[in-house]
Amino acid sequence: VPRWRQQWSGSGTTSRFPETVLARCVKYTEVHPEMRHVDCQSVWDAFKGAFISKYPCNITEEDYQPLVKLGTQTVPCNKTLLWSRIKDLAHQFTQVQRDMFTLEDMLLGYLADDLTWCGEFNTFEINYQSCPDWRKDCSNNPVSVFWKTVSRRFAETACGVVHVMLNGSRSKIFDKNSTFGSVEVHNLQPEKVQALEAWVIHGGREDSRDLCQDPTIKELESIISKRNIRFFCKNIYRPDKFLQCVKNPEDSSCLSGIHHHHHH
């Protein structure tokens, strides 16, 4: 007789979640020599321990601390790339610009990228049927708390000039409710971070507006300035050209400059 299971509004744990986490971890530690010391069995055990047998609307950042400790990794100064609502382009960029890193280029972000997971109170089972939805069920669910935890840590450890890629096609280019706006912005450390440079990515080919003057960008500038961090903004008018020029900086069409600077 199948036992009763809580029904949540969100989709269930990603199929083959444990195998995916393990396989990604093994591959990552092979590719990144500085992480060769990591035992992926311990990583999986710590990941599992954060949510298995726990009520999935009562997960805390503390639950993820053993995992965070195992995945400790540092990014060189000036090499952190944050992003908001434009993940694919940010990842395409760091795949070309190999010395810059998004959270998903780090072990823990890489493990969890695009995955969903949750357990159930008092059973060792993973719930493959449904997981809590952030809006409809609860915000303290395993996935949301994970990303909040690792995003906080990623921002806290950043240093030098930090870059953020923002989606200029959205009504709120800077959204205070995004992970960037609610977590990362507030956890950049002024004693380590000299400046935040925003790259506003334009969507339309003929869009020549200066989106660095957008009210939400002004709001971001205000928040950052109040935290004693300098703020710069650039329009990236042609993201396709931008990526092409990152790949081939010597290309003659790249030398004229593909974005406008706004120093604040």
Partner: antibody, heavy 117, light 107 residues
Framework: QVQLVQSGAEVKKPGSSVKVSCKAS????????INWVRQAPGQGLEWMGR????????YYAQKFQGRVTITADESTSTAYMELSSLRSEDTAVYYC??????????WGQGTLVTVSS | EIVMTQSPATLSVSPGERATLSCRAS??????LAWYQQKPGQAPRLLIY???TRATGIPARFSGSGSGTEFTLTISSLQSEDFAVYYC?????????FGQGTKVEIK
């Protein structure tokens, strides 16, 4: 309990191929690396390559590149190592070993492959 | 590839005595080094990883130390079941490579 059970001993002619199997018990077979390590009689250990079954991702030591093929059947939790163009120097015990890192925590019992005309 | 050199090739020790085995890497492998024990007719058994961390179920008399290019496996008080061949293995650079082994025999 993790166990790796390998296929039985083989006698092969020079120039032929051999395919050794390694059946795993225990959780999440597909997520770990299954490595192959060989040991010639009275000699040391030599890493040949590995597969991460879920990713279908293989990596071979340069020495064996082109001669070794490692595969996995996720439905039966079995990994395979095929070595072609056999020569007498390939006479060895072949081990499979499971890893979640660069070290090998679990080993099969070994399969003796004898290459002789 | 990184060459691992173990010394001595054979170590003769009396039961209850201390055994010290050495492993040298041809270039730095950081702390990415493991030690295995192998008895005749058996598969190797993991003893140490991360140069100094004992694997599950390994007695405290086995200890590892070192980093970079020089490593040591110490068996503080040899028991009869410890007489075997010991291998070091680096996992810092592809391909993973093993030393040629040190045989610990009864004196």
């Amino acid at each position: 309990q993790v166990q790796l059970v390998q296929s039985g001993a083989e006698v092969k002619k020079p120039g032929s191929s051999v395919k050794v199997s390694c059946k795993a018990s225990g959780d999440f077979f597909s997520g770990y690396a299954i490595n192959w390590v060989r040991q010639a009689p009275g000699q040391g250990l030599e890493w040949m390559g590995r597969i991460i079954p879920l990713l279908g991702d293989t990596y071979y030591a340069q020495k064996f590149q082109g001669r070794v093929t490692i595969t996995a059947d996720e439905s039966t939790s079995t990994a395979y190592m095929e070595l072609s163009s056999l020569r007498s120097e390939d006479t060895a015990v072949y081990y499979c070993a499971r890893s979640a890192a660069g070290w090998f925590a679990y080993w099969g019992q070994g399969t003796l492959v004898t290459v002789s005309s | 590839e990184i060459v691992m050199t173990q010394s001595p090739a054979t170590l003769s020790v009396s039961p209850g005595e201390r055994a010290t085995l050495s492993c040298r890497a041809s270039q730095s492998v950081s702390s990415n080094l493991a030690w295995y024990q192998q008895k005749p007719g058996q598969a190797p058994r993991l003893l140490i990883y991360g140069a100094s961390t004992r694997a599950t179920g390994i007695p405290a008399r086995f200890s590892g130390s070192g980093s970079g290019t020089e490593f040591t496996l110490t068996i503080s008080s040899l028991q009869s079941e410890d007489f075997a061949v010991y291998y070091c293995q680096q996992y810092n650079n592809w391909p993973w490579t093993f030393g040629q082994g040190t045989k610990v025999e009864i004196k």
